[in-house]
């Protein structure tokens, strides 16, 4: 109708001005639209400059919406990580505090003279939990070797024990089992418990990091055009009241977020593996009962050594020869009473159960995050039409949207009518993050089986990192061993951890 050809652009002026743009750009009345590059070229209230400004704005608004959704998920994962991390660290710190409080009374100089060895063990356990690249079994073996050497000297102050004799003692140790069953039990249980705890917390870190990195992936130019058409072309074409058709919006965002949707399978695998590994938090080899009770195994070990002292000495002499006696030294150390300590099994505090049930629920809630993202953004951010199908904005006019809704992921966008997607060019950042998810899932599966995987990263660039910054100080390049000088590749998923305590030692 010829009269409508010179419709006023008042509504567009209002919306455009509200966006912070200069009103001098807006024509008073509709103009011919041959200059439009994105919107349909009918009569329009938008100049080229306005179209460009609104295209940039719509692009920025979608990126903001995407980042907001990601931030909510990141915050949830970060809160979970902090809660579990605090709990696990608390268990270990509690055990160390108990040891420091009870061992001097229970074992006297057998403890105080070796406080450094015990402190080092807890430091190593803490570092291992936080993602340091050390071998837990080796660390424990070296602790026992070191402790045996020192305690044997203490229990036999009358003997001259040169380094070569102590070397021999060390070689005999495995057969002699001087500490009874405690080292073996601790090794089996601690390996399972620490592997489970650290891989679970690392999983949370990796998940959070993937979300953060993916949120930074820029939307391409084809997406920008499609989003402009979706959000602002209705204004330019004089139907500002028309809201986007739901299926139209979904197709645009499925095209824009095609690469992100490809995270879905590995994301689900990761979250499933994390939920699964929480099974390992319970029972006698569970995280709570083991990490919180390290000191009780240590007490059992010292008691066993004292009980076995005479047999042990006889066997050592048999294997290593008769050591010289220090004429000025005293007789053998008096047998101390057995160190009495609280029973090994810690009653569960209930904290971990609560943390796990919350985590399971929240992880289940976000399992379909990546494939539900287009729908979520459309319904929450795009002010979709609730009107009947033929009253919504379909990208060309007010009316029905006929094309079918595309499937999820890059491959399914081959015929997306709204966004031209090159399915042969997947986004490399997202491919790397898929790889990070795979690696972490494999770690969790190994951890579920009680295995401490060799933390070698197969990532393309090693860019994935559990806490966002890679390793804490230089934890990851270290490989502790008094005997060997082998080293492993750095671990790229470290944990946020406590600052290392630097107290004055009391020996």
């Amino acid at each position: 109708d010829p009269a409508s050809k010179s419709r006023s652009c008042g509504e567009v002026r209002q919306i455009y001005g509200a966006k912070g743009f200069s009103l001098s750009d807006v024509p008073q009345a509709e103009i011919s639209g041959e200059h439009l590059r994105i919107c349909p070229q009918g009569y329009t209230c938008c100049t080229s400059e306005m179209e460009e400004n609104l295209a940039n704005r719509s692009h920025a608004e979608l990126e903001t919406a995407l980042r907001d959704s990601s931030r909510v998920l990141q915050a949830m994962l970060a809160t979970q990580l902090r809660s579990f991390d605090d709990h696990f660290q608390h268990l270990l710190n509690d055990s160390e505090r108990t040891l420091q409080a009870t061992f001097p009374g229970a074992f006297g100089e057998l403890y105080t003279q070796n406080a450094r060895a015990f402190r080092d063990l807890y430091s190593e356990l803490r570092l291992y939990y936080r993602g340091a690249n050390l071998h837990l079994e080796e660390t424990l073996a070296e602790f026992w070797a070191r402790l045996l050497e020192r305690l044997f000297k203490q229990l036999h102050p009358q003997l001259l024990l040169p380094d070569d004799y102590l070397d021999c003692l060390g070689k005999q140790a495995e057969a002699l089992r001087p500490f009874g069953e405690a080292p073996r039990e601790l090794r089996l249980r601690a390996t399972r418990a620490f592997v489970a705890a650290r891989s679970f917390v690392q999983g949370l870190g990796v998940a959070s990091d993937v979300v953060r990195k993916v949120a930074q992936v820029p939307l391409g130019p084809e997406c920008s055009r499609a989003v402009m058409k979706l959000v602002y072309c209705a204004h330019c074409l004089g139907v500002p009241g028309a809201r986007p058709c739901p299926d139209y919006c979904r197709n645009v965002l499925k095209g824009c977020l095609a690469n992100q949707a490809d995270l879905d399978a590995e994301w689900r695998n990761l979250l499933d593996s994390m939920v699964l590994i929480t099974d390992k938090f319970w029972g006698t080899s569970g995280v709570e009962s083991v990490i919180g009770s390290v000191h009780t195994w240590l007490a059992e070990a010292i008691n066993a050594l004292q009980d076995n002292r005479d047999t042990l000495t006889a066997k050592v002499i048999q294997g290593c020869g008769n050591p010289k006696v220090n004429p000025q030294g005293p007789g053998p150390e008096e047998k101390r009473r057995r160190g009495k300590l609280a029973p090994r099994e810690r009653p569960p505090s209930g904290t971990l159960e609560k943390l796990v049930s919350e985590a399971k629920a929240q992880l289940r809630d976000v399992q379909d995050f990546w494939i539900s993202l287009p729908g979520t953004l459309c319904s929450e951010k795009m002010a979709l039409s609730t009107a009947s199908d033929d009253r919504c904005w379909n990208g060309m006019a007010r009316g029905r949207y006929l094309p079918e809704v595309m499937g999820d992921g890059l491959a399914n966008q081959i015929n997306n009518p709204e966004v031209e997607v090159d399915i042969t060019k997947p986004d490399m950042t997202i491919r790397q993050q898929i790889m990070q998810l795979k690696i972490m899932t494999n770690r969790l599966r190994s951890a579920y089986n009680g295995n401490d995987v060799d933390f070698q990263d197969a990532s393309d660039d090693g860019s994935g990192s559990g806490s966002g910054d890679g390793c804490l100080d230089d934890l990851c390049s270290r490989k502790v061993s008094r005997k060997s000088s082998s080293s492993r590749t750095p671990l790229t998923h470290a944990l946020p951890g406590l600052s290392e305590q630097e107290g004055q030692k009391t020996s």
Epitope: D120, E500, E502
Partner: antibody, heavy 119, light 107 residues
Framework: QVQLVQSGAEVKKPGASVKVSCKAS????????MHWVRQAPGQGLEWMGE????????TYNQKFKARVTMTRDTSTSTVYMELSSLRSEDTAVYYC????????????WGQGTLVTVSS | VIWMTQSPSSVSASVGDRVTITCRAS??????LAWYQQKPGKAPRILIY???TLQTGAPSRFSGSGFGTDFTLTISSVQPEDFATYYC?????????FGGGTKVEIK
């Protein structure tokens, strides 16, 4: 063979800080504690503290606790000792020394670094 | 703090002499004691650990004895290269402490 190579001599003004390095080779760096011992001209030996290169844990002599910081870099097998708020009585040769085994006894020593504090 | 007291602070000897240096701890340190030799401009060198065990590579004319609080370093027959300063050190508790040193001089 085990070698500890320290950084060169330093001249500092009172109130300044000095950071001495000690690069280790010939053994597993993370397997043995490293200590710092100083010796003022014509005087005896004074223990300053130790660092566990494996964990970074440190223990300092109370006398230096407020002024000394020991750190390590496992990638270069190097330990560092930083002493702040220097005064003239800190003029000394500073040695790094590696424990023999887990026994607080020093089997290997660096060549020493002379730090002179003078206005 | 465990204080280590060495005596004498210096001793003059001729080549071939027997020299004895003593070290006393302010409290019992069992056998946690080491002896070092230091020559001018050089770093100390370990001779004895665990009070009486000779370090590999140290000459057999050096010997250590003692337990608890009283310790002795003996050079059975002083050689020209033995003229140096000797320090004892306790390794039982922090802070680790050294004796004040004993200078063995040529008579």
């Amino acid at each position: 063979q085990v070698q500890l190579v320290q950084s060169g001599a330093e001249v500092k003004k009172p109130g300044a800080s000095v950071k001495v390095s000690c690069k280790a080779s010939g053994y597993t760096f993370t397997g043995y504690y490293m200590h710092w011992v100083r010796q003022a001209p014509g005087q005896g030996l004074e223990w300053m503290g130790e660092i566990n290169p494996s964990t970074g844990d440190t223990t300092y002599n109370q006398k230096f606790k407020a002024r000394v910081t020991m750190t390590r870099d496992t990638s270069t097998s190097t330990v560092y000792m930083e002493l702040s708020s220097l005064r003239s009585e800190d003029t000394a040769v500073y040695y790094c020394a590696r424990e023999k085994r887990d026994d607080g006894v020093f089997a290997y020593w660096g060549q020493g670094t002379l730090v002179t504090v003078s206005s | 703090v465990i204080w280590m007291t060495q005596s004498p602070s210096s001793v003059s000897a001729s080549v071939g002499d027997r020299v004895t240096i003593t070290c006393r701890a302010s409290q019992a340190i069992n056998g946690w004691l080491a002896w070092y030799q230091q020559k001018p401009g050089k770093a100390p060198r370990i001779l004895i650990y665990s009070a009486s065990t000779l370090q590999t590579g140290a000459p057999s004319r050096f010997s250590g004895s003692g337990f608890g609080t009283d310790f002795t370093l003996t050079i059975s027959s002083v050689q020209p290269e033995d003229f140096a300063t000797y320090y004892c050190q306790q390794a039982k508790s922090y802070p680790l402490t050294f004796g004040g040193g004993t200078k063995v001089e040529i008579k």
